[in-house]
Amino acid sequence: EEELQVIQPEKSVSVAAGDSATLNCTVSSLIPVGPIQWFRGAGPGRELIYNLKEGHFPRVTAVSDPTKRNNMDFSIRISNITPADAGTYYCVKFRKGSPDVELKSGAGTELSVRAKPS
């Protein structure tokens, strides 16, 4: 059985303040069943950025339809970027359970925010 890979192709992304940022993430397999969540940072303080299952994330949308059968693209778009959004973002695969169990994290994408051109 091929090991699941969580692929974040860009090591870094630079966006002008006020623009939208797209953070790409794909998985190499549909198995095992379970959600993808996006976090900023790692360790105790990592912040939940997007979770399809629950929560309210008004500035974050899925690029592809995550409810579509056989979807393997879990990229997100964050709108109206501000300097406070800078950081390293991780796409993380969980195995469905009670609670869900973290399986594998992508390598991370560092988002930097440029001043809005005048």
Partner: antibody, heavy 117, light 108 residues
Framework: DVQLVESGGGLVQPGGSLRLSCTAS????????MSWVRQAPGEGLEWVSA???????YYTDSVKGRFTISRDNSKNTLYLQMNSLRAEDTAIYYC???????????WGLGTLVTVSS | EIVLTQSPGTLSVSPGERVTLTCRAS??????IAWYQQKPGQAPRLLIY???SRATGIPGRFSGSGSGTEFTLTITSLQSEDFAVYYC??????????FGGGTKVEIK
């Protein structure tokens, strides 16, 4: 405004147990890491334990196997179950919100735990 | 474990003076240092993070600098409300997160 309110402290005998609570408001609790930091009388700050937004748990070596951190996102509450308490666990226990890159941006006022016979 | 050493342990200064507190790390921490102020009977308050970024609502007289293993907190023109204990904390390695022993800034 972010508010963190600790409760549950008190006097307990060595070997005893206590459960601390921290009720949070003013932010989306489930999305953020939360932590317990303690301060023994007249001493400095010591990080004790943390629970990430995804529910992962972290402990300092001296409390591993004795303390358990947990959270109830539906109640916006963080807990610290403390078992097999020792005199050296005597301290003010602060609840703190952890930022995405692991420092503490908001703190409660603390609750005093005294372990003594 | 990353050990943080703060110096001096106590600093006696007069209001209006400039104060520099030092925090040394036992290994490189890529500028991941935070500073807190704690007054008697109160919880700590975040002043600085990422070595030099001021937290929300912190006056401009507080500034942080440094890189590698040596970091400083500077208070220009010390005010009466600034007499307190100051702690540094590394946020580079979370196993475990560690604080320095503190520096007490007292009235001369």
């Amino acid at each position: 405004d972010v508010q963190l309110v600790e409760s549950g402290g008190g006097l307990v005998q060595p070997g005893g147990s206590l459960r601390l609570s921290c009720t949070a408001s003013g932010f989306t609790f489930r999305n953020y890491g939360m932590s317990w930091v303690r301060q023994a009388p007249g001493e400095g700050l010591e990080w004790v334990s943390a629970s990430s937004g995804s529910g992962s748990t972290y402990y300092t070596d001296s409390v591993k196997g004795r303390f358990t951190i947990s959270r109830d996102n539906s109640k916006n509450t963080l807990y610290l179950q403390m078992n097999s308490l020792r005199a050296e666990d005597t301290a003010i226990y602060y609840c703190a919100k952890v930022t995405w890159n692991n420092f503490f941006d908001y703190w409660g006022l603390g609750t005093l735990v005294t372990v003594s016979s | 474990e990353i050990v943080l050493t703060q110096s001096p342990g106590t600093l006696s200064v007069s209001p209006g003076e400039r104060v520099t507190l030092t925090c040394r790390a036992s290994q490189g921490i890529a500028g991941k240092i935070a500073w807190y102020q704690q007054k008697p009977g109160q919880a700590p308050r975040l002043l600085i993070y990422d070595a030099s970024s001021r937290a929300t609502g912190i006056p401009g007289r507080f500034s942080g600098s440094g890189s590698g293993t040596e970091f400083t907190l500077t208070i220009t023109s010390l005010q009466s409300e600034d007499f307190a204990v100051y702690y540094c904390q590394q946020h580079y390695d979370w196993s475990p997160l560690t604080f320095g022993g503190g520096t007490k800034v007292e009235i001369k």
